[in-house]
Amino acid sequence: FQTFEGDLKWHHHNITYWIQNYSEDLPRAVIDDAFARAFALWSAVTPLTFTRVYSRDADIVIQFGVAEHGDGYPFDGKDGLLAHAFPPGPGIQGDAHFDDDELWSLGKGVVVPTRFGNADGAACHFPFIFEGRSYSACTTDGRSDGLPWCSTTANYDTDDRFGFCPSERLYTQDGNADGKPCQFPFIFQGQSYSACTTDGRSDGYRWCATTANYDRDKLFGFCPTRADSTVMGGNSAGELCVFPFTFLGKEYSTCTSEGRGDGRLWCATTSNFDSDKKWGFCPDQGYSLFLVAAHEFGHALGLDHSSVPEALMYPMYRFTEGPPLHKDDVNGIRHLYGPRPEPEPRPPTTTTPQPTAPPTVCPTGPPTVHPSERPTAGPTGPPSAGPTGPPTAGPSTATTVPLSPVDDACNVNIFDAIAEIGNQLYLFKDGKYWRFSEGRGSRPQGPFLIADKWPALPRKLDSVFEERLSKKLFFFSGRQVWVYTGASVLGPRRLDKLGLGADVAQVTGALRSGRGKMLLFSGRRLWRFDVKAQMVDPRSASEVDRMFPGVPLDTHDVFQYREKAYFCQDRFYWRVSSRSELNQVDQVGYVTYDILQCPED
């Protein structure tokens, strides 16, 4: 093993980490779990503990980024450099960055969670054997109802374990049809559709009607994404494999390497490659986020690369399902932090539960009862010509959290985000929010749980704004944005989808700027944002101090309240009023005392 010069290390043992944003390659819960397990490798052999927090002053900030992403070490596109980490220390030191141009998996292909079947929601196992053939994506083979399924073990023929893959024929997400499956064909604007479509939408999300006639019933849902068959490269990147497809007159119901000399798997994205010539590469095994994270966290704790090829800290990625830590890794980390004080826990013994009823040879259909829980995240209804979102929710039945001193908004030093929603001021902090209406003797109401009202959101928000016309709520956290229309949500989406470059680490605020337009802020910069198109005008980039002279340059939140702009720094705000095109600071005050009218005791 090697350590950094001078045995660079953390000088406290309770290390905190913040997952600033996410990759879209894996479900959030899987990412959270991969990072937690990676930290657990190191805490199992040292006195270190790792606690997840939701603020940027964490010791280890974890970020997904592409190319230039805000440090001096740009990523390099797919493959090559997978991630990087800084050695222990303040600021960016200790942080770990992951290249989101990689396909992140658990090392064995895309992670596709299943529903129904007999595998209790286990993820697909790619490749898997069915009737002697190998499948690297979900398939409809062996079924007459067109539902895609997969084996959750390497061999369906011997193990009989399966589940259904995300499919619009099984369920839809969000929309206004309570998750009902698509109805094909369906009528939209007088035209017949026999597959999901993006027509009527500007955001590229695929949707369908859940009755035979959208024009009449206005019921719709969003089609689940199929990570297992979303192609890369070729001439159809981002589109789905179509199975079966015809290639050189022969039919293929799984990805194939036929016609290639390099063995790479590909598929057609229409039913006939011979006539349409549309194709892309099938997802590869991807890189294990768990293993790469474990290696990067080794760096973040003070370990340099090892010269032992079997060690986790060896500088080359190698997928393994065995215990990742080598004796050399353990020696290295203990050289820095010492051994774990108490005896190392023995792994629990587990028994594999047996299915209660013997499954049939071929996957059976899903139960008739659909799952009661709706997905919490997903896009809202298509704008303009397309289906509209459901009506906005009525009075919320938000849970009030048991009160403690910190739950009084007046005791909050710095709020994560503040926004005027409706005619009330909403103040967000660490998974909670308060509501405030101006008036003599009025006090903030709450706290309420963000998760109750907006379940898709993370605990830590950077900024929030409401677009008055559409009543859309925009929530920003790290490099991601969620857009709520009533109870339905679009997102999370990456900031690049709004036209903000990889150098924009977060959106720190927003102000109205004319009909359907906003100003988005990030640190010292701002952009004009078209709410309908959900896109910034890249030519509109400007420096904050040019447009708003006199406000601090390191504001952490910008919001609009009572037609004035507020720039927050620490516990203070700078209020800006606009008179005859001039923006002037007309007040500096405390958020708590001067806006929330808290008593100064």
Partner: antibody
Framework: EVQLLESGGGLVQPGGSLRLSCAAS???????DMWWVRQAPGKGLEWVS?????????FYADSVKGRFTISRDNSKNTLYLQMNSLRAEDTAVYYC?????????????????WGQGTLVTVSS | DIQMTQSPATLSLSPGERATLSCRAS??????LAWYQQKPGQAPRLLIY???YRATGIPARFSGSGSGTDFTLTISSLEPEDYAVYYC?????????FGQGTRLEIK
């Protein structure tokens, strides 16, 4: 002992081309990012280009983008800089330099070994 | 791009004296700063990396300090071989940039 040896410099007319090479020895070449840095006569240092260890990523200073191409042959432990459409302002001593850090550990900022430099003169 | 400003442009000191060279970044670069020494007709030589770590073979009279935007290279007692041009270089943000250099000359 680590050594970097540049070659390929010389006098060339504006609009012309030149290919610089840098032969490396004494370290595991394929593990390290490699850089070209130049210095105009009597002036300071200016980075030109970098290529990552795998050769999978290359980056260029705005002043040379679209005209220069960096490449490497890890089997030959050699770094290259193909310079096309040369201009008078490209006149400089060109150094190849080895990054002190490697791979995914991004702390040790600095170029710990430099070649002796090769002079490129662009003049008619 | 981040601008690196070195001061003074020229520093005239006698052998045995203490030399203090300054480098300022136009925005915070954490500790991602290196110092190089260059003598006439020679390639630059790495002295300090990550603001304060001495490179292999560099005498203890050379030390670096600072973080954020302000950095200092100190030569505690000048030797005749120390007279040269000194450059700072940042990698706190992309792309990397160099300072314009400080010439250290014999008084």
């Amino acid at each position: 002992e680590v050594q970097l040896l540049e070659s390929g410099g010389g006098l060339v007319q504006p609009g012309g081309s030149l290919r610089l090479s840098c032969a490396a020895s004494g370290f595991t070449f394929s593990w390290y990012d490699m850089w070209w840095v130049r210095q105009a006569p009597g002036k300071g240092l200016e980075w030109v280009s970098v290529i990552y260890s795998s050769g999978g990523a290359t980056f260029y200073a705005d002043s040379v983008k679209g005209r220069f191409t960096i490449s490497r042959d890890n089997s030959k432990n050699t770094l290259y800089l193909q310079m096309n459409s040369l201009r008078a302002e490209d006149t400089a001593v060109y150094y190849c330099a080895k990054d002190r850090a490697y791979g995914d550990y991004v702390g040790w900022n600095g170029f710990d070994y430099w070649g002796q430099g090769t002079l490129v003169t662009v003049s008619s | 791009d981040i601008q690196m400003t070195q001061s003074p442009a020229t520093l005239s000191l006698s052998p045995g004296e203490r030399a203090t060279l300054s480098c300022r970044a136009s925005q915070s670069i954490s500790s991602f700063l290196a110092w190089y020494q260059q003598k006439p007709g020679q390639a630059p030589r790495l002295l300090i990396y990550d603001a304060s770590y001495r490179a292999t073979g560099i005498p203890a009279r050379f030390s670096g300090s600072g973080s954020g935007t302000d950095f200092t290279l100190t030569i505690s007692s000048l030797e005749p071989e120390d007279y040269a041009v000194y450059y700072c270089q940042q990698r706190g943000n992309w792309p990397i940039t160099f300072g314009q250099g400080t010439r250290l000359e014999i008084k």
